[in-house]
């Protein structure tokens, strides 16, 4: 389980068509 102070930081992963983009790349979301 993530610590409380981490909860508002994004987690970043590689994906395609994520983060409002059409191609593949890194995407960071809370």
């Amino acid at each position: 389980r993530r610590r409380r102070r981490d909860t508002h930081f994004p987690i970043c992963i590689f994906c395609c068509g994520c983060c409002h983009r059409s191609k593949c790349g890194m995407c960071c979301k809370t």
């Epitope: 981490d6 395609c16 191609k23 593949c24 790349g25 890194m26």
Partner: antibody, heavy 121, light 107 residues
Framework: QVQLVESGGGVVQPGRSLRLSCAAS????????MHWVRQAPGKGLEWVAV????????YYADSVKGRFTISRDNSKNTLYLQMNSLRAEDTAVYYC??????????????WGQGTMVTVSS | SYELTQPPSVSVSPGQTASITCSGD??????ACWYQQKPGQSPILVIY???KRPSGIPERFSGSNSGNTATLTISGTQAMDEADYYC??????????FGGGTKLTVL
């Protein structure tokens, strides 16, 4: 101004350990992912590892996985690379680099000056 | 493992256009970045997300990416542009790939 300064490089024997540091200034360190990238003498760039905002969100190149550990101390604005079981092929200039800001940080937008690591008996 | 292939060297006359290619499997499906590195110096980001220029990078630097090839184009090449250039792309969360680098010579 925005700056990254690496330290901790040197000459080390195969199988030994070394810890590199990267001191960041001029920006809010905790708001950025941070990378280590290396460059063997006369060769190209090779990505080593990244640590994102949460300390547990980190990834490694296959060539260093299980031997190197990336970490950060946001209170000290410092990035680290703990290198264990060093091999001759780890000889390189090691750069720390900042990931782009935002939710799509594909690029490395700020680089340090590098620190040289030589693995030799 | 994935590879990005660049020509080892490209030569151009001052004022002319230089094109540096970066080829890889389905390169056009991922975002390409380009870095400039002069001897004894650290790399500098010149193009990101295929076509975008960071602030401070001259307009003569541009990029494109489709099919299996990303291209860095330098229009009106100047002597100060002589450097090594590296492309870069992500193939997974644990696989950031750099091209082998291209030495640009301004004749």
């Amino acid at each position: 101004q925005v700056q990254l300064v690496e330290s901790g490089g040197g000459v080390v024997q195969p199988g030994r350990s070394l810890r590199l540091s990267c001191a960041a200034s001029g920006f809010t360190f905790s708001n950025y992912g941070m990378h280590w990238v290396r460059q063997a003498p006369g060769k190209g760039l090779e990505w080593v590892a990244v640590i994102w905002y949460v300390g547990s969100n980190k990834y490694y190149a296959d060539s260093v996985k299980g031997r190197f550990t990336i970490s950060r101390d946001n209170s000290k604005n410092t990035l680290y690379l703990q290198m264990n079981s060093l091999r001759a092929e780890d000889t390189a200039v090691y750069y720390c680099a900042r990931a782009q800001e935002g939710m799509a940080p594909d690029a490395f937008d700020i680089w340090g000056q590098g620190t040289m690591v030589t693995v030799s008996s | 493992s994935y590879e990005l292939t660049q020509p080892p060297s490209v030569s151009v006359s001052p004022g002319q256009t230089a094109s540096i290619t970066c080829s890889g499997d389905k390169m056009g499906e991922r975002y390409a970045c380009w870095y400039q590195q002069k001897p004894g110096q650290s790399p500098i980001l010149v193009i990101y997300q295929d076509t975008k220029r960071p602030s401070g990078i001259p307009e003569r630097f541009s990029g494109s990416n489709s099919g299996n090839t990303a291209t860095l184009t330098i229009s009106g090449t100047q002597a100060m542009d002589e450097a090594d250039y590296y492309c870069q792309a992500w193939y997974s969360s644990t696989n950031v790939v750099f091209g082998g680098g291209t030495k640009l010579t301004v004749l």
